[in-house]
Amino acid sequence: MMTGTIETTGNISAEKGGSIILQCHLSSTTAQVTQVNWEQQDQLLAICNADLGWHISPSFKDRVAPGPGLGLTLQSLTVNDTGEYFCIYHTYPDGTYTGRIFLEVLESSVAEHGARFQIP
């Protein structure tokens, strides 16, 4: 029986050009984690494997940093980074646990502040 649960940072927002840490935590199971995959929609961002360590997908190498822990740091955020992110824990013997994080990348606070008070 898969008794575990994944706690995530949930819905988060960050400023364009900034960085954000995506984090998941697996609890309530004795299962042992062999690998964690980080995905954005259907794109693989990174893998943390028990033997091989971290692998960052080539297309994200410049903007993705491993850690802290099994988490992932996204840097130089753009509005296009807005969307769903998934942490996929491959565990023995339970199998796969998936956590979801929704990231919204906002225009810089100055721009956002200006837009908010614009007179039509």
Partner: antibody, heavy 119, light 109 residues
Framework: QVQLVQSGAEVKKPGASVKISCKAS????????MNWVRQAPGQGLEWMGW????????TYAQKFQGRFTFTLDTSTSTAYLEISSLRSEDTAVYYC????????????WGQGTLVTVSS | QAVVTQEPSLTVSPGGTVTLTCGSS?????????ANWVQQKPGQAFRGLIR???GRGSWTPARFSGSLLGGKAALTISGAQPEDEAEYYC?????????FGGGTKLTVL
């Protein structure tokens, strides 16, 4: 390369205890679970349970709760199976196998340890 | 406890294709059963061939493939070799424990 090397054959009297070892090499011991499986003469394979090598927490199959104990020595990358109050029906070959969570299952196996219980 | 069934024995010609199956007394086998296939050659240790229904070990030859077929787990050997002659055991995961089948003795003749 990954290897699981088990201790040698044991002959014990009923009521005695035995402790068999499974020494792992070629990978980080605490990253993968360790299973114990037995095969009695002329019988099939039975999964006894597994131990989380990171936390040290054992999980026993229902049939193997009580007289069977899984332990670890992480400093030597060794898993142990201890059986107390041995009975003749404990005569079997005992195997350790590594538990992998990426495509769930048992990937590497030890060569087996024959335990014979006889008066 | 569930009973896992395999063909007791099968024969294949060298270069031929053979499918070994693994059924469950509880109903159709699914991906949640994480079907495993383990090979044992005479006088040798067990070797994990397939994990998680269709995941090959890094040492598993490409001619071995795992799948679900008609409600059972299946191991297909395409282009059997003499060295494939062995006993093959399947194991299925049932929520909190593994159950092994009785094994299939494969002869390459």
């Amino acid at each position: 390369q990954v290897q699981l090397v088990q201790s040698g054959a044991e002959v014990k009297k009923p009521g005695a205890s035995v402790k068999i070892s499974c020494k792992a090499s070629g990978y980080t011991f605490t990253n993968y679970g360790m299973n114990w499986v037995r095969q009695a003469p002329g019988q099939g394979l039975e999964w006894m349970g597994w131990i989380n090598t990171y936390t040290g927490e054992p999980t026993y199959a229902q049939k193997f709760q009580g007289r069977f104990t899984f332990t670890l020595d992480t400093s030597t990358s060794t898993a142990y199976l201890e059986i107390s109050s041995l009975r003749s029906e404990d005569t079997a070959v005992y195997y350790c196998s590594r538990g992998n969570g990426y495509y769930v299952g048992m990937d590497y196996w030890g060569q087996g340890t024959l335990v014979t219980v006889s008066s | 406890q569930a009973v896992v069934t395999q063909e007791p024995s099968l024969t294949v010609s060298p270069g031929g294709t053979v499918t070994l199956t693994c059924g469950s007394s509880t109903g159709a086998v699914t991906t949640s059963n994480h079907a495993n296939w383990v090979q044992q050659k005479p006088g040798q240790a067990f070797r994990g061939l397939i994990r998680g229904t269709n995941g090959r070990g890094s040492w598993t030859p490409a001619r071995f493939s795992g799948s679900l077929l008609g409600g059972k787990a299946a191991l297909t050997i395409s282009g059997a070799q003499p060295e494939d002659e062995a006993e093959y055991y399947c194991a299925l995961w049932f929520s909190n424990h593994w159950v092994f089948g009785g094994g299939t003795k494969l002869t390459v003749l």
